[in-house]
């Protein structure tokens, strides 16, 4: 069969499975005169043979693990032994079969993990090798945890990356591992070839002993610090410690105070830097952060609580320079005249702010001293000895000592003796008739003036009139303000009127004095008046139950998922139709009848969260009035953005020739949400062929170093592919390219002859 098994001498490649005994020839080369014989050279390993007439064959089974490619040469010789054709390259590629089992590099591994370590962050790698071809399933290894000992409540605390053998904590392991309860664990790990997918796969097992170490990165107990400390500052008040040396500590003031009186040193000791004042601020909450040498957080921040303890550094203060009370001439002994309420800025309900009251002087002392007494702790003044007579002494002045346990303050009280309250207020008319108002009448409007008179002593509590609505306004829509000079009452609207709930209100007013009436006198019908408020209907817009509706969903919810709902009611009871306004991204639709909101397109937190749209409720029929409310959709992050380079890295160059291996640093980012800790990317070369020339090493969660492995580079541009994995759930990987130019340099810059090429690299390494 010319072409497949025979033909002229030319470069050829053949693929043969390893482990198979020879069953047929490889190829029959045809000689062209003057050629008379064929000769085979190269990596024959005494397996490959060519007959003089050009028959190429092999004489025993091949082994890919010994040699995966045999590079042979075939030459055609004339009768004298001179090569007249060739030598041409003949390549034999040995195809892999699964004839090697995976083997762990160690029969036992030991490692340690700190409690509360980040889930998914590897703390140990197990490693197995398989001599079979890693580009085929035969050499593709699959790691699994066979058993975890002990296993508590059937919960796995550890997980393994099936491909890399990286062992890390699960979410439960991060939360629950505790060296005090269980300081060590044992895992049995298996490795299978065939990617773990075949019944015919080979396997091996190893044992992993794991020690759980204490996480000392813990929030300290709340601190109490006495205010106004006179000790030299700064004063150490507490401490935090990262698990390993070399962390950089800082404090974060979440409250953004104008004065933040705390600091932290590089040991993690926390200090108060100046005296505190409890009356200015009685407690502080701030955060301690530990970062690595590149400024990346090593873990979550710790919350530090400082409570400021009170000392008695504030005296009592009087409510006003002079406190005025009234007492009627005929009041009985023991009657309350009024209560003096002094203040103390020290901590409430402590001895530092507990006040005592004592009368230290009464003037005039007529007809005698000691006419008044004050309750020691309550500050209530009472009539102590007898009724008072206005014509004898119309006014008394008291000096009252108010004290806490360390300070004393004098307060002044003026007591006016007034005429007895033996006259009741009398309304000038008992019925103020009907008043018709539209339901949209403005709040604050005066809708009625009422008037009562009182014959008692003018400008005293006996003649002052207070108006109360005692019936017909349970919603508190109306109020009455009194003019203190004329005792005129002004009825005002305090809350919106509502035809739908109160079309007619029968209002009753009562007029009364702040001073009590004398014994035997009572308020009667003269102190009451009424009026009827009639509210007319105004077609009102629908009313939403909330100004802002908020919902929270994961950004990867399926299209058609209900993401929230809104509700509105029409005051007139009409049906409502809902619609959306401002859905600029076309993500949502609303059910016109129910107000339920659904997704109609893929959501994307990175495009902006919360996503704000307006919802409109419109009356169906009537005058089609509408109202608008806000709908805020908070999108929770899922790991849906692969890592990428943080900036443009065109223009990287090394001066050629390299005098020593060089390196450059690059930064990765992605658009997903990273809370306190920031991203934790891992970096690797994008293809195996790059490993001879380049090496990539992680610096921290976002930065890596690309280094040359040697100095023998050509003077040209190399495109280095880097694989960046975000370790998320699910993990996403980005392949980025770093273009690196090796060029002749003049004064540290790339030299390009005139008219050469544009895009001159600008960053030398």
């Amino acid at each position: 069969q010319e072409g497949k098994f025979s033909g002229p001498l030319k470069p050829m490649t053949f693929s043969i499975y390893e482990g198979q005994e020879p069953s047929q020839i490889i190829f029959q080369f045809k000689a062209n005169p003057p050629a008379v014989t064929f000769e085979l050279t190269g990596e024959t390993d005494n397996i490959f043979v060519i007959e003089r007439e050009g028959l190429l064959y092999y004489n025993r089974a091949l082994d890919r693990e010994t040699r995966s490619t045999h590079n042979l040469q075939v030459a055609a010789l004339d009768a004298n032994g001179i090569i007249v054709e060739g030598p041409v390259p003949i390549t034999i590629k040995v195809k892999d079969i699964n004839d090697n089992r995976p083997t762990f590099l160690q029969s036992k591994y030991e490692g340690s993990v700190r409690q509360n370590s980040r889930p998914g962050k590897p703390f140990l790698y197990v490693n197995a090798t398989d001599l079979d071809d890693p580009a085929t399933p035969n050499g593709q290894l699959y790691y699994q945890i066979v058993i975890q000992l002990p296993m508590i409540n059937n919960v796995m605390y550890f997980q393994i990356n099936n491909k890399t053998g990286a062992i890390s904590l699960t979410r439960e392991g991060s939360q629950e591992l505790n060296p005090a309860k269980n300081p060590s664990y044992n895992l049995v790990i298996s490795v299978k070839d065939m990617g773990g997918q075949s019944e015919n796969s080979f396997s091996d097992t190893t044992s992993v002993d794991i020690i759980v170490t204490e996480n000392i990165w813990k929030a300290p107990k709340p601190v109490e610090m006495v205010e106004n400390s006179t000790d030299p500052h700064p004063i150490k008040i507490t401490q935090v410690r990262w698990n390993d040396p070399g962390a950089q500590y800082s404090l974060v003031d979440k409250e953004k105070l104008p004065r933040f009186p705390f600091s932290i040193d590089q040991e993690g000791d926390i200090y108060v830097t100046q005296p505190l004042d409890r009356e200015e601020k009685d407690a502080y909450v701030f955060y301690a952060v530990a970062k690595d040498e590149y400024g990346k957080p090593l873990s979550y921040p710790l919350e530090i609580h400082v409570k400021v303890k009170d000392i008695n550094d504030n005296p009592p203060t009087c409510p006003s320079p002079v406190t005025v009370f009234e007492v009627q001439e005929n009041e009985r002994l023991g009657n309350s005249i009024g209560t003096l309420t002094a203040h103390d800025r020290d901590e409430e309900n402590t001895a530092n702010s507990f006040l005592n009251y004592r009368i230290v002087e009464q003037t005039p002392k007529l007809p005698m001293d000691g006419l008044f007494l004050i309750q020691t702790y309550a500050g209530m003044l009472q009539l102590a000895k007898q009724s008072l007579k206005k014509q004898d002494t119309p006014q008394y002045n008291l000096t009252i000592e108010v004290s806490d346990k360390d300070f004393k303050t004098l307060c002044f009280v003026q007591i006016n003796v007034i005429d007895i309250n033996d006259q009741i207020p009398i309304f000038e008319k008992s019925d103020y008739g009907n008043l018709t108002l539209a339901e949209d009448t403005n709040i604050g409007s005066t809708i009625l003036t009422i008037q009562a008179t009182d014959a008692d002593e003018p400008f005293t509590g006996s003649s002052k009139i207070l108006y109360h609505i005692i019936k017909g306004d349970s919603e508190g829509r109306l109020g009455v303000d009194t003019d203190p000079h004329t005792n005129t009452g002004y009825v005002i609207i305090k809350k919106p009127l509502d035809f739908e709930t109160a079309a007619v209100s029968n209002i009753v007013f009562k007029a009364e004095n702040p001073e009590p009436l004398v014994f035997g006198v009572k308020y009667n019908a003269s102190s009451f008046a009424k009026f009827t408020l009639i509210v007319t209907d105004v077609n009102e817009a629908p009313q939403f139950s909330q100004h802002v509706f908020q919902a929270k969903v994961s950004e990867d919810v399926a299209i058609g998922t209900k993401v929230g709902n809104v509700t509105a009611k029409d005051p007139e009871g009409l049906d409502i139709s809902y619609s959306l306004r401002g859905d600029t991204r076309g993500w949502l639709k609303i059910d016109h009848v129910t107000g339920e909101i659904f997704s109609v397109a893929p959501l994307d937190r990175e495009a902006g969260s919360p996503y704000r749209v307006q919802v409109v409720a419109t009356e169906v029929g009537g005058s089609s009035l509408s109202s608008v409310s806000e709908f805020h959709l908070i999108l929770m992050d899922v790991n849906d953005n692969p890592p990428r380079l943080a900036k443009d890295y065109t223009g990287l160059f090394f001066c050629h020739p390299l005098s020593a291996p060089g390196s450059l640093i690059f930064e990765a980012t992605d658009d997903d949400q990273h809370l306190f800790r920031g991203p934790h990317f891992t970096f690797s070369l994008g293809s195996g062929s790059l490993q001879n020339d380049w090496e990539v090493s992680k610096i921290n969660g976002t930065h890596a170093r690309l280094s040359t492995r040697h100095t023998e580079f050509e003077e040209r541009e190399y495109v280095v592919l880097i694989r960046i994995n975000d370790g998320g759930r699910p993990p996403l990987e980005g392949i980025v390219s770093l273009p690196v130019t090796f060029c002749s340099c003049v004064e540290g810059s790339c030299f390009r002859p005139a008219g050469h090429q544009t895009g001159i690299p600008t960053v030398g390494m």
Partner: nanobody, 115 residues
Framework: EVQLVESGGGLVQPGGSLRLSCAAS????????MGWYRQAPGKQRELVAN???????NYADSVKGRFTISRDNAKNTLYLQMNSLRPEDTAVYYC?????????WGQGTQVTVSS
């Protein structure tokens, strides 16, 4: 992989003798025509002598009667016996298998004839 390794070169006075050897590997030595070539500084490579697979020999005029080429197929080795050496014989001597056009070459050995 075919390898040809020359040895036996060196410094010799005019009228002296040297024996060059060429050890071959990675090939069926007996099937190839073998030869010695030389290249003096600033000059082109030239044939000194060759021996075909049947044992027939061939010499350049400038060395006839002074140089002898031979082969030992059992030892996969080619030889060149050089007598009555002259200063103009100074050159790098190369072993060849399969002819100058398409064949295999060794790395060469230096022969210097000088008083």
């Amino acid at each position: 992989e075919v390898q040809l390794v020359e040895s036996g070169g060196g410094l010799v006075q005019p009228g002296g003798s040297l024996r060059l050897s060429c050890a071959a590997s990675g090939m069926r030595f007996s099937q190839y025509a073998m030869g010695w070539y030389r290249q003096a500084p600033g000059k082109q490579r030239e044939l000194v002598a060759n021996i075909f697979k049947d044992g027939t020999t061939n010499y350049a005029d400038s060395v006839k009667g002074r140089f002898t080429i031979s082969r030992d197929n059992a030892k996969n080795t080619l030889y060149l016996q050089m007598n009555s050496l002259r200063p103009e014989d100074t050159a790098v001597y190369y072993c060849n298998a399969g002819g100058a056009a398409l064949g295999y070459w060794g790395q060469g050995t230096q022969v210097t004839v000088s008083s």
